[in-house]
Interface confidence: medium
């Protein structure tokens, strides 16, 4: 019979020879013969192969690398890569989230109006009067000053946008 | 200088608990948020938990999610993660890092080991 120009799905062409394919999460070993099947091996872990395929060598799982703002979203398997997302405050550079970047952080005098998303930045808005922030954050919001009177006490210090109010106790008249 | 000095690791059985802390000096602890990454051998670094600068705003990784819990004490300089339930798979070297500064200050980290 004349050899095949072409194969079924799921089959390569090889020595003029349809060859079975790999399943997804194998990789090839050997080709098949007239006598024998087409070898394929399981990926190692930490590989993947997610396609049928005659690939000799498995490829790396993807590192979700913490340093770039990087953590797992789903761990890969045998036949799908990891997929990696940003650590909280920090969004995607691109839609394959190979990097990310850093949210800012609101400096003192400023709190956050809106935590960071994994597609836009932190907000940050100015303490209003009868609050502060003397922190740098991006997650912390502006907070109240104390109030000095549920405590029995009275303003020593007055309360800025960075600074919370410094509570005394009140004066006693002697007589 | 800064410094950060994690400590509190050790052997445990699976199921078991740990309290690791981290001691830092050098620079204004109480006004950064900080953070716990990990590295178990032969495997890259993987974030854990994130808490704000005044603790009021925590975040976990979904492995340790309910297992897990960061804290702080700003009078003490101090971080924190409790970690119950543990398992095999949480053996690695524990590190605290400043968030949201990438890697510039390193402890030499706190061993945890889950074993049977």
């Known amino acids: 019979p004349e050899p095949p120009t072409a194969c079924r799905e799921k089959q390569y062409l090889i020595n003029s020879q349809c060859c079975s394919l790999c399943q997804p999460g194998q990789k090839l070993v050997s080709d098949c013969t007239e006598f024998t099947e087409t070898e394929c091996l399981p990926c190692g872990e930490s590989e993947f192969l997610d396609t049928w395929n005659r690939e000799t060598h498995c490829h790396q799982h993807k590192y979700c690398d913490p340093n770039l703002g990087l953590r797992v979203q789903q761990k890969g398997t045998s036949e799908t890569d990891t997929i990696c997302t940003c650590e909280e405050g920090w969004h995607c550079t691109s839609e394959a989230c190979e990097s990310c970047v850093l949210h800012r952080s609101c400096s003192p005098g400023f709190g956050v109006k809106q935590i960071a998303t994994g597609v836009s930045d932190t907000i940050c808005e100015p303490c209003p009067v009868g609050f502060f922030s003397n922190v740098s954050s991006a997650f912390e919001k502006c907070h109240p000053w104390t109030s000095c009177e549920t405590k029995d006490l009275v303003v020593q210090q007055a309360g800025t946008n960075k600074t919370d109010v410094v509570c005394g106790p009140q004066d006693r008249l002697r007589a | 200088e800064v410094q950060l000095l994690e400590s509190g690791g050790g052997l445990v059985q699976p199921g078991g608990s740990l309290r690791l802390s981290c001691a830092a000096s050098?620079?204004?602890?109480?006004?950064?948020?900080m953070r716990w990454v990990r590295q178990a051998p032969g495997k890259g670094l993987e974030w854990v938990s994130t808490i704000s600068s005044s603790g009021t705003y925590t975040y976990y990784a979904d492995s340790v999610k309910g297992r897990f819990t960061i804290s702080r004490d700003n009078s003490k300089n101090t971080l924190y993660l409790q970690m119950n339930s543990l398992r095999a798979e949480d053996t690695a070297v524990y590190y605290c890092?400043?968030?949201?500064?990438?890697?510039?200050?390193w402890g030499q980290g706190t061993l945890v080991t889950v074993s049977s």
């Open positions: 890092a400043k968030y949201p500064k990438n890697f510039d200050y």
């Open positions: 050098g620079f204004t602890f109480s006004v950064y948020d």
